[in-house]
Every structure is written in C-alpha cells, then in structure tokens.
C-alpha cells in the first residue's frame, strides 16, 4: 500500500530573468527512493538518480542547475517558462508518486511565492 | 552528423596502464554524458562508468571504482578511459556511447576499441 | 545491482514471422529499460527507450511494451536484416545489461 505523501513548494511566481528552486519532498514512506524525474508538461527536464546523479537534458543543461537535494534551480527565467511542473518519485517498493508545482514567471517586480501545499 | 570516433586496438602487458580516447563531432560533449561500456569477446555488455563533462562529475561500476579513470578534454571534444593493472580479463572491446537526452540509455555509439592483454 | 534475464538464450525465426524477446528484473524498476541490436563486428544499436518509446530511424516493426520487473520487445515481421544480438538495459539503479538474446533468421 502507498502511504507517502508529496509536499511541493505549490503555486510559484517569480521575475523574468531570475532564478526559481522547484522543491518536493516526499514523506510518511519507508519506501527508498531510486529516481526522481523533473518535467516540465510533458518534457523531461532532468533526472536525479540515487546511484547515477544527475541527468540534465541537454536542451536545459545550460539553466537548470541540479539541487539543493533533489529539487531543480530554474535559471535565466523567460515568460515561456510558465506552467506545470512535476516531481515523479520512483520509489522501492511502493511505487510512483507525482507532485505538481505551478510556475508564473512575471514580467514585473511584483512576484511573491505561493503557499505550500500537499499532493496525497 | 553526430558521432563518437575511437583510438584504434591496442596490445598491452598484464599490469599495465591503457589510455582509449573517444572523439565526438557533430556535438559539444559539454551538453551531454559520455559513458564507457565493456564488452569482452562473445559476451554481454558491461558498464564502467560516466562523465558530465561540463564539470568533469564522474561515476563509476563499483567492479570499475579505483582502476578506471574516465575524464575529458572540452578544447578537443574528446573523452578518455584509463585503465590501470590490466589482466587478461580486460580483454574486451570499450565502447564510448553518449546518453540520451532525456535519461541514461545511449543513443550514439563509437565504433568501439580492441584492448588486448598480453605477455 | 539489478539483474536483467533475456529469454530466450537463442531463438531461430523464419522472415515475416513475429518475434517476441523477454526481459525480467529482479526488482521493480518502473519503465527504465531499454532495448539495443547488436550485429557482428559492430556496436549496439539503440532499439527502444523507456520500455515503449520509439526511437527515430528505428523500423516500425520493432516495439516494446512492459513495465515493473517483466518486458518485452516484439519484431512484428521479421526481416533477414534482424539477425543479430538483443540486450536490454535498465536506468533504475547502476546501470547493467541482460546477458542478450540471439537472433537467428532460418
């Protein structure tokens, strides 16, 4: 049976031209997590697996940055960078568990973040 | 066209040291992985290791770990496998496939390198 | 490590029939497999990725289906130019190969 529990840093804003940190975090699971996929719609962004490291698509490689732990560093952001993002676990032996993360980049000084909020 | 270009066979003695280069064009080697596969004589495929090049972020088959060593040369375009303390089980064919973009499979391969290991 | 077992060994098929190939892990590794040919004297060609996807310049008539610990690859009708080795490759852990499956055309 799944038990986790993906927490995400939510519905997210930021500027145009600045940096954004897309955090999960998965809980209230013994499960071991082997991989954990970041995509963008359907695009993958990155992979971060426990024993390989990190995998940057090479399409990304030069403003994603790996971390902090197994989060991704959007940089360099564009207004084309709005949309879902999603965190997949891959996990031993309970499976997959997906979060969703809501990214707005803005073009003025008024972004704020969004409040955290959890995906059973 | 994108492609991986491997130095040719070599013949070595046991307990020697082996350096197998790996050349890509029609690509920068910064925006990928490149890997180093083993494949002794009639036999399955065997991974040793990787490396992000645009770090020099490296990973290694615990089998691997100590006695290969693979780094780059980003001005050249060229990746390198070392491999130390040879035994005639390092008789193989190594391949330099790169990764995928979206993962850890390999979509492009080298033509591969004979290593012999001989006294 | 993650143990991949192909079967069969060896297998002889005649031209136009279908071909199915397996792939069993020995745990769970979600659809982080992927499937390569192998002729003589040659190196490994990417087949399938990710279990199902297809790969460009890859014929039609190879496909992949499967997902956990069992997989398959399947030539839907197979041409004298099949013949060669099969390996599948899992992403999940360390990366290790299956021991290959040997095509032969009659």
């Known amino acids: 049976m799944m038990t986790g529990t993906i927490e995400t840093t939510g519905n997210i804003s930021a500027e145009k031209g600045g940096s954004i940190i897309l955090q999960c975090h998965l809980s209230s699971t013994t499960a071991q997590v082997t991989q954990v996929n970041w995509e963008q719609q359907d695009q993958l962004l990155a992979i971060c697996n426990a024993d390989l490291g990190w995998h940057i698509s090479p399409s990304f490689k030069d403003r994603v940055a790996p971390g902090p732990g197994l989060g991704l560093t959007l940089q360099s952001l564009t207004v084309n960078d709005t949309g879902e993002y999603f965190c997949i676990y891959h996990t031993y032996p309970d499976g997959t568990y997906t979060g969703r993360i809501f990214l707005e980049v803005l073009e003025s000084s008024v972004a704020e973040h969004g409040a955290r909020f959890q995906i059973p | 066209e994108v492609q991986l270009v491997q130095s040719g066979a070599e013949v070595v003695k046991p307990g020697a040291t082996v350096k197998l280069s790996c050349k890509a064009s029609?690509?920068?080697?910064?925006?990928?992985?490149i890997n180093w596969v083993k494949q002794r004589p009639g036999k399955g495929l065997e991974w040793i290791g990787r490396?992000?090049?645009?770090?020099?972020?490296?990973k290694y088959a615990e089998k691997f770990q100590g006695r290969a060593t693979i780094t780059t040369d980003t001005s050249s375009n060229t990746a390198y496998l070392q491999l130390s303390s040879l035994r005639s089980e390092d008789t193989a064919v190594y391949y330099c496939?790169?990764?995928?973009?979206?993962?850890?499979?390999?979509?492009?391969w080298g033509q591969g390198t004979m290593v012999t290991v001989s006294s | 490590d993650i143990v991949l077992t192909q079967s069969p060994d060896f297998q002889s098929v005649t031209p136009k029939e279908k071909v199915t190939l397996s792939c069993r892990a020995s745990?769970?590794?979600?659809?982080?497999l992927h499937w390569y040919q192998q002729k003589p004297d040659q190196s490994p060609r990417l087949l399938i990725k990710?279990?199902?996807q297809s790969i460009s310049g890859i014929p039609s008539r190879f496909s992949g289906s499967g997902s956990g610990t069992y997989f398959t690859l399947s030539i839907n009708s197979v041409e004298a130019e099949d013949f060669g080795m099969y390996f599948c490759?899992?992403?999940?852990?360390?990366?290790?190969f299956g021991q290959g499956t040997k095509l032969e055309i009659k």
């Open positions: 990710y279990a199902s």
């Open positions: 496939p790169k990764s995928g973009d979206y993962g850890w499979y390999f979509d492009v």
């Open positions: 029609g690509f920068n080697i910064k925006d990928t992985y």
């Open positions: 745990q769970s590794i979600s659809n982080n």
């Open positions: 490759q899992q992403s999940n852990s360390w990366l290790t």
């Open positions: 490396i992000d090049p645009a770090n020099g972020d490296t």
